[in-house]
């Protein structure tokens, strides 16, 4: 990346397009949810970051490469009743027009006497939307990063059984630091309450249907969680995520 | 429904200081990158300054650099423009534009607020 | 800087004409251009984006075409309520950088 633009804009918290390349680790982690190489274990001989292309390349549908993106599914299709099954997704109510990959299948509603296949480890993601407001909308989400990841997705729950969905207040960045200096002209100690600016949600993926139907199924959730950095470089996410992260063993400390 | 609007506008003499205010709704704030657009009568548009209200991060035009300081309060969903040293050529209808794109700079402006006018003038 | 030049300056057409406005980029910004309409004393209004994708609700005849340095707007059947002024915009780099605008007046 020889670009003094470039080097100057990156990890800066923006996303620039003309620093968002493998070269420039995508500006930094700042295009790629600040994971600065989502192909650092693909093994690949291809560039597959540069393969993404509507087409199928082989040499990179592994798991290590993001399954190529998924371009190597020989029926590629898009759910028939997505509105319906969007609405209807997760409910508990086996809906069998929604039972299919592309529908998400109905969000193991068709599946509940089946045993759970667990991918091993912990996606965290921080959202910048408020915990209340990402619950009540946590089937909608569930389904755009199951479709994504082409699987399922579900909120992991701590000892007590309650929802890991924790909120967030940013991180303590001289930048960030500054920002609150500004705006609100009080001493740090003085500031009452935090401001909560978005979630912290701790996800599992159960590929219970996803083995039944494909063999691109994430082992883990390295993998899953470098396919949606992968989404953040194409623009193609639906949320306004800021981070994701792998855990393997269970996160010790939630928060 | 999302909608931008904008206050803080009028006369000011050259050398003075002024400040712009843009309360946001409809969305959320913190997610969506803002920019100041502005206009001198009867020309076009001239972007002005840039920020990511979520990290604090901010992008300035040359002419505008070390005079003008964008920032945002995410408690009141409202960015600003703070701006120092004005010239007679800072004279424009300025407009605060929200990015498509979450804390991407390179998307493009969808919502644009009404606009307020900033005469710079002895 | 990324320079955008846009041609014509401004145009006459009337009610039902094909009017197609170009824009020059001094390099290449791939896609990321987008297309405004502006009306007198109105704030400018997105009507393309990534070259040839329409915002939501703009009419069908409103196309973008282009990539890398030459983009083109097209209208396909000008509407009495088309009378405005156009302008592109890159935003693969910053400064982001408009074009002049191109006025489209009533023949």
């Known amino acids: 990346c020889q670009s003094q633009y470039c080097a100057d804009k990156a990890r800066d918290g923006i996303c620039d397009e003309a620093c968002n390349s493998h070269a420039c680790q995508w500006d930094g982690g700042d295009c790629s949810l600040t994971m600065e190489d989502p192909w650092a274990n693909c093994t690949s001989t291809l560039r597959c970051w540069e393969y993404i292309n509507n087409q199928c390349d082989e040499q990179c549908n592994t798991a290590e490469c993001l399954f190529d993106n998924f371009e190597c599914q020989r029926n590629s299709k898009t759910c028939k009743y997505d509105k319906y099954c969007a609405d209807h997704f997760k409910d508990n109510h086996c809906d069998q027009g929604c039972n299919s990959e592309e529908c998400g299948w109905d969000g193991l509603d068709c599946a509940s006497d089946q045993p759970e296949n667990l991918a091993e480890g912990t996606l965290i993601i921080v959202v910048l939307l408020p915990p209340e407001q990402l619950l009540q909308d946590s089937r909608s989400f569930l389904r755009a990063l199951g479709t994504l990841l082409h699987t399922n997705l579900r909120i992991k729950q701590d000892s007590q059984g309650a929802l890991m969905v924790y909120p967030y207040f940013g991180e303590k960045s001289a930048a960030m630091k500054k920002q609150k200096m500004t705006r609100r002209s009080l001493p740090e100690e003085q500031e009452q309450e935090q401001e909560v600016i978005g979630s912290k949600i701790f996800l599992e993926i159960d590929n219970r249907q996803c083995v039944q139907d494909s063999d691109q199924c994430f082992k883990n959730t390295d993998a899953a969680a470098a396919l949606l950095a992968s989404h953040a470089i194409q623009g193609t996410l639906s949320y306004p995520l800021v981070s994701v992260f792998s855990e393997l063993e269970s996160p010790r400390n939630a928060q | 429904e999302v909608q931008l609007v904008e206050s803080g506008g009028g006369l000011v003499q050259p050398g003075g200081s002024l400040r712009l205010s843009c309360a946001a709704s409809?969305?959320?704030?913190?997610?969506?990158?803002m920019s100041w657009v502005r206009q001198a009568p009867g020309k076009g548009l001239e972007w002005v300054s840039y920020?990511?209200?979520?990290?604090?991060?901010?992008y300035y035009a040359d002419s505008v650099k070390g005079r003008f300081t964008i920032s945002a309060d995410t408690s009141k969903n409202t960015a600003y423009l703070q701006m120092n040293s004005l010239r007679a050529e800072d004279t424009a209808v300025y407009y605060c534009?929200?990015?498509?794109?979450?804390?991407?700079?390179?998307?493009?402006?969808?919502?644009w607020g009404q606009g307020t006018l900033v005469t710079v003038s002895s | 800087d990324i320079q955008m030049t846009q041609s014509p300056s401004s145009l006459s057409a009337s009610v039902g004409d094909r009017v197609t406005i170009t824009c020059r980029a001094s390099?290449?910004?791939?896609?990321?251009l987008a297309w405004y309409q502006q009306k007198p004393g109105k704030a400018p209004k997105l009507l393309i984006y990534?070259?040839?994708s329409r915002a939501s609700g703009v009419p069908s005849r409103f196309s973008g075409s282009g990539s890398g340095t030459d983009f083109t707007l097209t209208i396909s059947s000008l509407q009495p309520e088309d009378f405005a002024t156009y302008y592109c915009?890159?935003?693969?780099?910053?400064?982001?950088?408009f074009g002049q605008g191109t006025k489209v007046e009533i023949k």
């Open positions: 534009a929200r990015h498509s794109g979450y804390y991407r700079i390179s998307s493009a402006m969808d919502v």
């Open positions: 409809g969305y959320t704030f913190s997610s969506y990158g």
């Open positions: 920020i990511y209200p979520y990290s604090g991060a901010t």
């Open positions: 390099q290449s910004n791939r896609r990321f």
């Open positions: 990534g070259a040839s």
């Open positions: 915009q890159q935003y693969y780099i910053s400064p982001l950088t």
